[in-house]
Amino acid sequence: FERTRSLQDPCSNCPAGTFCDNNRNQICSPCPPNSFSSAGGQRTCDICRQCKGVFRTRKECSSTSNAECDCTPGFHCLGAGCSMCEQDCKQGQELTKKGCKDCCFGTFNDQKRGICRPWTNCSLDGKSVLVNGTKERDVVCGPSPADLSPGASSVTPPAPAREPGHSPQ
């Protein structure tokens, strides 16, 4: 089938990095500068993506593959193939229509992107708050209040040291 197809269509012989040039009797011509073809049999080469402005070049364009972009520091990629760069915020903030805003009390964000999330409600699991939450960190839940009855301790005491020469009882 391949041989039949190549007899019918000389363009199918053109490899990636070339295009089938109708102006030159359908011979395979190399892609011009700043263009590429990632598959064989192409009748045109695609224009290389340019990583401009907030976008920076992660991988240069070649005759067989497009350029790849990522974002300059202070921004992160969004969308397929990094089609957008979104502003980073600080930990303890979220991005709103008016820019980066501090997380409201009772919420936190430990990343430079995404939204502020509510602190864990320890009591839902029957636990108590061991470490309070902040804008940047979730609360840390500890043992349940029942485990902390008078005389009980949340920290396991160390095993008593054995005296040399004594076997365990």
């Epitope: 401009k52 957008m84 979104e86 502003q87 820019g99």
Partner: nanobody, 121 residues
Framework: QVQLQESGGALVQPGGSLRLSCAAS????????IGWFRQAPGKEREGVLC????????YYADSVKGRFTISRDNAKNTVYLQMTNLKPEDTAVYLC??????????????WGQGTQVTVSS
């Protein structure tokens, strides 16, 4: 066609001031934010300041707070970056871009070519 043209770059002494302009043409200027970025020799490009279509400012770089301000004149399709108390570390090529929103840039946004600012005694 769409164009963004920066101007106003110069050699200035430390402590001096400069006003850069970003003049736009070929698109509905009022609908777009304008962001300023800079690239110093051998360093990563960094965001400086942005002004939204409604006139609100977003600082990308903490190092310019209190020294740089941004404004826009929609009648002249121009955004201005006013830079005061300039430091040698402000030396860079400054370029402007036109996103829809200061917090999000798209790969098909418009960009200028840049203007050189050199701070040196």
């Amino acid at each position: 066609q769409v164009q963004l043209q920066e101007s106003g770059g110069a050699l200035v002494q430390p402590g001096g001031s400069l006003r850069l302009s970003c003049a736009a043409s070929g698109f509905t200027f009022d609908d777009y934010a304008i962001g300023w970025f800079r690239q110093a020799p051998g360093k990563e490009r960094e965001g400086v300041l942005c002004i939204s279509s409604s006139g609100g400012s977003t600082y990308y770089a903490d190092s310019v707070k209190g020294r740089f301000t941004i404004s826009r004149d929609n009648a002249k399709n121009t955004v201005y970056l006013q830079m005061t108390n300039l430091k040698p570390e402000d030396t860079a090529v400054y370029l402007c871009g036109a996103p829809r929103d200061c917090s999000r840039y798209s790969s098909d946004d418009y960009w200028g070519q840049g203007t050189q600012v050199t701070v040196s005694s």
